[in-house]
C-alpha cells in the first residue's frame, strides 16, 4: 500500500537549510528515490512530490538514496550549496566515485575551513597549494593520511602534486625520513621515489610492504638493493625466518633470484608450505581497502629472536617499535624493578609506559607503582589520580626519584592520593614528606592541616614550619600543645617554640611565668593580636635576657604595635629607651569593645586601638 506522504518514511522536517538542501538534491537528480527501499519496509517509496512538499531531515535519508549523481548538475550550484552537500555526504558516509569527488572538489573554489566535516576522500582532489601556511597544511595532510590515496591512480595529476606538498609541509629535507615522517605521509609513502627507499630503508620498507598495487621500477630496484644489503629492519636474507617472510609478503615480488637463493631453503620451503596450507596467508588481492592484518604487520610483528622472555639491558638496543612489539606488558609489570636500572632513553620509556597503560587502563597496581623509578617522571597527574597508593615504601621510592627537584604536579598529586588513602597525615607519612620537602606542611591549606593528628606533630622540625603563615599555625598550634602536654617546662618550650605563631594570649601569659627566655626571632613571629594584651612585665619575663632585642625591633610588628599599647612609664622600666608608649593622663579605648556593644562593625575591622586625649585634671581624678 502506498504511503500518503513521505514523512513517516523520511522523518520529520529538519532545519530550513537541510530541507532546502534535500530539495536541491532531488531537483538536481543527485538523489534518486530508491525503490529498493520499499523492499526493506515492504512498502513503496514515497512519491517525489510528497518529499518536496515536506522537505525532510537529511539525516533520515539512507546512503543508498544519496548515490549516483551526474556531475553536470552540480555546476550551477553556489559554493555554499556544494559545501552543504559535501558535508551531508560525509555525514552519511556515502562512497563517491572518482568523478563525483573531482567534480565536488572543483566546485569548492576557496579552501574550506571545516576540513573535518568533508568526505575524507574529497580532500585528495583539493589543491594542496590552497593550504600553504604551516598550520593549514598540517591540518590538511593530517586528514589526507587517513584518506584512501589509491582512489587516484599513480599517474593522476592530483596524486602527483600531493607528495611534494606533503614533504614540504612536514619539513622533510633530502631523502632521509624518520619513522614519524613515514607515519605522517600515510598512503603517500607508497609514492616515495627510490632514493627515499635507498636512504630510509629501515623505516620505509615495512611501510612499502602494505602498499596496494605494484611498486614502480625505481622503487623496486631500491627495495631490492636495500634487502640484499641486509641492513635493518630485516637483516641479511641468510638470517631470514618464516616470520621475516611473513612480514615481507608485500615485497616478495620484488626480491629477485639472488636474494631468494640466499634465504635458507628450509625457510622458503616452510613458508611456501604454510602459505599453501592456510589461505589467509596467500598473497592478498590488491584491494583498495587493505586487509587490517597487513597494515599491522609493520607495527606489531616482533622480529624473529627478539621477543623478550626477561627484561634485561639488551633491550636498550631495540627501536621503539621493537619494544612495543617484543616486550609483553605483563612481563614488564612483573619485572618493573629492573627497568629503573637499565639506561633506557626517554623515548623508550614512553613505549614502556604505553604498554603499562594498555595493561592497566584503570590505574597501575601498587606492585608496579613501587618500582616505577624514573618512569614515574613520565606520569601525568591524570595517571596518578587512578592509583591507590597505601604503602609508605612506595611513596618513598617515588619521592626518591624526584629528590632535589621542586615539588612537581605529579608529586603533589601522588601525596594527595596517598594522604587521602590513609585518611589522615600520620607521623610516619609526615616524617617522610618533610624529609623530602621541608616546606611540605606549609603547602597544605588549613583545612588539610586539620586532618593532621596531634601524634604526627612529633615528626615536625622547626625548619618545616619556616614558610607557614599565621592561618596554618593557628591550626597546628593546638595540635602541638596537645602533643607535647606531658613534657616539663623547658623541654615543652623547646618543642612548642616553632608553633607559637599560632598561640593565643593566655598561653603566652602562661609561658611568661616559666622563665622560658624566648628569642626575638620567635617573638617576632607571634600573632600581633596575641602579643598586644601582654604587659611589659609579662614580655620581660617571656623574653628574659633577650628583652634587649626589643630596641632593634621597635619599628617592626608586632613590637611596634605592642609599644603603642603600653604606658610609657612601664616601657621606661625596661631601660631600653623604647619610645611611643601612652603618656600619663591618656586613656586607651579598644574599638573592638565599642563594636561589640553597638553591633555595628567598624570599617577598619576589629581590634584597632583608639587613643583619646582625656586631659583629666588631677583634681577631677581626685
Amino acid at each position: 500500500m502506498a504511503l500518503p506522504t513521505a514523512r513517516p518514511l523520511l522523518g520529520s522536517c529538519g532545519t530550513p537549510a537541510l530541507g532546502s538542501l534535500l530539495f536541491l538534491l532531488f531537483s538536481l537528480g543527485w538523489v534518486q528515490p530508491s525503490r529498493t527501499l520499499a523492499g526493506e519496509t515492504g512498502q513503496e517509496a514515497a512519491p517525489l512530490d510528497g518529499v518536496l512538499a515536506n522537505p525532510p531531515n537529511i539525516s533520515s535519508l539512507s546512503p543508498r538514496q544519496l548515490l549516483g549523481f551526474p556531475c553536470a548538475e552540480v555546476s550551477g550550484l553556489s559554493t555554499e550549496r556544494v559545501r552543504e552537500l559535501a558535508v551531508a555526504l560525509a555525514q552519511k558516509n556515502v562512497k563517491l566515485s572518482t568523478e563525483q569527488l573531482r567534480c565536488l572538489a572543483h566546485r569548492l573554489s576557496e579552501p574550506p575551513e571545516d576540513l573535518d566535516a568533508l568526505p575524507l576522500d574529497l580532500l585528495l582532489f583539493l589543491n594542496p597549494d590552497a593550504f600553504s601556511g604551516p598550520q593549514a597544511c598540517t591540518r590538511f595532510f593530517s586528514r589526507i593520511t587517513k584518506a584512501n590515496v589509491d582512489l587516484l591512480p599513480r599517474g593522476a595529476p592530483e596524486r602527483q602534486r600531493l607528495l611534494p606538498a606533503a614533504l614540504a609541509c612536514w619539513g622533510v629535507r633530502g631523502s632521509l625520513l624518520s619513522e614519524a615522517d613515514v607515519r605522517a605521509l600515510g598512503g603517500l609513502a607508497c609514492d616515495l621515489p627510490g632514493r627515499f627507499v635507498a636512504e630510509s630503508a629501515e623505516v620505509l620498507l615495512p611501510r612499502l610492504v602494505s602498499c596496494p598495487g605494484p611498486l614502480d621500477q625505481d622503487q623496486q630496484e631500491a627495495a631490492r638493493a636495500a634487502l640484499q644489503g641486509g641492513g635493518p629492519p630485516y637483516g641479511p636474507p641468510s638470517t631470514w625466518s618464516v616470520s621475516t617472510m611473513d612480514a615481507l609478503r608485500g615485497l616478495l615480488p620484488v626480491l629477485g633470484q639472488p636474494i631468494i637463493r640466499s634465504i635458507p631453503q628450509g625457510i622458503v620451503a616452510a613458508w611456501r608450505q604454510r602459505s599453501s596450507r592456510d589461505p589467509s596467508w596467500r598473497q592478498p588481492e590488491r584491494t583498495i581497502l587493505r586487509p587490517r592484518f597487513r597494515r599491522e604487520v609493520e607495527k606489531t610483528a616482533c622480529p624473529s629472536g627478539k621477543k623478550a622472555r626477561e627484561i634485561d639491558e639488551s633491550l636498550i638496543f631495540y627501536k621503539k617499535w621493537e619494544l612495543e612489539a617484543c616486550v609483553d606488558a605483563a612481563l614488564l609489570a612483573t619485572q618493573m624493578d629492573r627497568v629503573n636500572a637499565i639506561p633506557f632513553t626517554y623515548e623508550q620509556l614512553d613505549v614502556l609506559k604505553h604498554k603499562l597503560d594498555e595493561l592497566y587502563p584503570q590505574g597501575y597496581p601498587e606492585s608496579v607503582i613501587q618500582h616505577l623509578g624514573y618512569l614515574f617522571l613520565k606520569m601525568s597527574p591524570e595517571d596518578i589520580r587512578k592509583w591507590n597508593v597505601t604503602s609508605l615504601e612506595t611513596l618513598k621510592a617515588l619521592l626518591e626519584v624526584n629528590k632535589g627537584h621542586e615539588m612537581s604536579p605529579q608529586v603533589a598529586t601522588l601525596i594527595d592520593r596517598f594522604v587521602k588513602g590513609r585518611g589522615q597525615l600520620d607521623k610516619d607519612t609526615l616524617d617522610t614528606l618533610t624529609a623530602f620537602y621541608p616546606g611540605y606542611l606549609c603547602s597544605l591549606s588549613p583545612e588539610e592541616l586539620s586532618s593532621v593528628p596531634p601524634s604526627s606533630i612529633w615528626a615536625v622540625r622547626p625548619q618545616d614550619l619556616d614558610t607557614c603563615d599565621p592561618r596554618q599555625l593557628d591550626v597546628l598550634y593546638p595540635k602541638a600543645r596537645l602533643a607535647f602536654q606531658n613534657m616539663n617546662g623547658s623541654e615543652y618550650f623547646v618543642k612548642i617554640q616553632s608553633f607559637l605563631g599560632g598561640a593565643p594570649t593566655e598561653d603566652l601569659k602562661a609561658l611568661s611565668q616559666q622563665n622560658v627566655s624566648m628569642d626575638l626571632a620567635t617573638f617576632m613571629k607571634l600573632r600581633t593580636d596575641a602579643v598586644l594584651p601582654l604587659t611589659v612585665a609579662e614580655v620581660q619575663k617571656l623574653l628574659g635576657p633577650h628583652v634587649e632585642g626589643l630596641k632593634a625591633e621597635e619599628r617592626h610588628r608586632p613590637v611596634r604595635d605592642w609599644i603603642l599599647r603600653q604606658r610609657q612609664d612601664d616601657l621606661d622600666t625596661l631601660g631600653l629607651g623604647l619610645q611611643g608608649g601612652i603618656p600619663n593622663g591618656y586613656l586607651v579605648l579598644d574599638l573592638s569593645m565599642q563594636e561589640a556593644l553597638s553591633g555595628t562593625p567598624c570599617l577598619l575591622g576589629p581590634g584597632p586601638v583608639l587613643t583619646v586625649l582625656a586631659l583629666l585634671l588631677a583634681s577631677t581624678l581626685a
Partner: antibody, heavy 118, light 111 residues
Framework: EILLQQTGTVLARPGTSVKMSCKAS????????MHWVKQRPGQGLEWIGG????????NYNQKFKDKAKLTAVTSTSTANMELSSLTNEDSAVYYC???????????WGQGTTLTVSS | DIVLTQSPASLAVSLGQRATISCKAS??????????MNWYQQKPGQPPKLLIY???NLESGIPARFSGSGSGTDFTLNIHPVEEEDAATYYC?????????FGGGTKLEVK
C-alpha cells in the same frame, strides 16, 4: 670487550663444599642474568641455574636445587656458585654464561675444572 | 623436562660440502610465534660458542655459511660450504621451558 673470567682449577674432598667465582667485565653486570652450566668429561651440557644480580632473583634446575647455591656480589661484578656435599659425580667443568632476554647464552666463561677426589 | 635428541651423533663431511645436523624436541619449543631453539659450537678445550638463536637467527660475527631452520619439535643446523675450522661438536639447546636443556651433541669431522 665482554669477558667472563673464572677460577681455573679447584680440587676438593668428597663431602666438602666449594665456591667458584666468575668475574664479569665489559657490560653492566647487574642488568643481565648469569647462568651456570655443567659439563662432565666427554659428555653433554647441563644447565644448573641462573641469577639476576640486580635483584638476586634466582632460578634453578630442580636437579641441582640442593647441590648449588648461586649468589652475586654487585660491587665486584662477580657471580658465585657454591656446590655442597661433593661427590665424584660433581667432577666436571663448570661454565658461567651470560643470558640474553631469557632466550639464549651469548658469552661463556672459560670454565672452572672441579676435581673431587679423596 | 624437554628432551632434545640430536642426530647423527657424529658425521664426516668433505671440505666444501654441506653438513646437516638435526635436533628433535620431545615437545614443542615454540611460543608466541618464536622457536626457542639455539645452536652452539664447541671445540676441544674451549667453551661453547653461540651460532644461531631462535631457530634461524645468525649471531653477529658468525659466518653466513651457518644457517638454522625449523619450528615446533624439528630443527636443523646447516653448514655450507663446510670449512676445516668447522670441525667441532655442535649442541642444540631449548630455552622455552625451565629447565633449559641441551642435546647430546653432534661431532663434525671435516675430511
Amino acid at each position: 670487550e665482554i669477558l667472563l673470567q673464572q677460577t681455573g682449577t679447584v680440587l676438593a674432598r668428597p663431602g666438602t663444599s666449594v665456591k667458584m667465582s666468575c668475574k664479569a667485565s665489559g657490560y653492566t653486570f647487574t642488568n643481565y642474568r648469569m647462568h651456570w652450566v655443567k659439563q662432565r668429561p666427554g659428555q653433554g651440557l647441563e644447565w644448573i641455574g641462573g641469577i639476576y644480580p640486580g635483584n638476586s632473583d634466582t632460578n634453578y634446575n630442580q636437579k641441582f636445587k640442593d647441590k648449588a647455591k648461586l649468589t652475586a656480589v654487585t660491587s665486584t661484578s662477580t657471580a658465585n656458585m657454591e656446590l655442597s656435599s661433593l661427590t665424584n659425580e660433581d667432577s666436571a667443568v663448570y661454565y658461567c654464561l651470560r643470558g640474553i632476554r631469557g632466550s639464549y647464552f651469548d658469552y661463556w666463561g672459560q670454565g672452572t675444572t672441579l676435581t673431587v677426589s679423596s | 623436562d624437554i628432551v632434545l635428541t640430536q642426530s647423527p651423533a657424529s658425521l664426516a663431511v668433505s671440505l666444501g660440502q654441506r653438513a646437516t645436523i638435526s635436533c628433535k624436541a620431545s615437545q614443542s619449543v615454540d611460543y608466541d610465534g618464536d622457536s626457542y631453539m639455539n645452536w652452539y659450537q664447541q671445540k676441544p678445550g674451549q667453551p661453547p660458542k653461540l651460532l644461531i638463536y631462535a631457530a634461524s637467527n645468525l649471531e653477529s660475527g658468525i659466518p653466513a655459511r651457518f644457517s638454522g631452520s625449523g619450528s615446533g619439535t624439528d630443527f636443523t643446523l646447516n653448514i655450507h660450504p663446510v670449512e676445516e675450522e668447522d670441525a667441532a661438536t655442535y649442541y642444540c639447546q631449548q630455552s622455552n621451558e625451565d629447565p633449559s636443556t641441551f642435546g647430546g651433541g653432534t661431532k663434525l669431522e671435516v675430511k
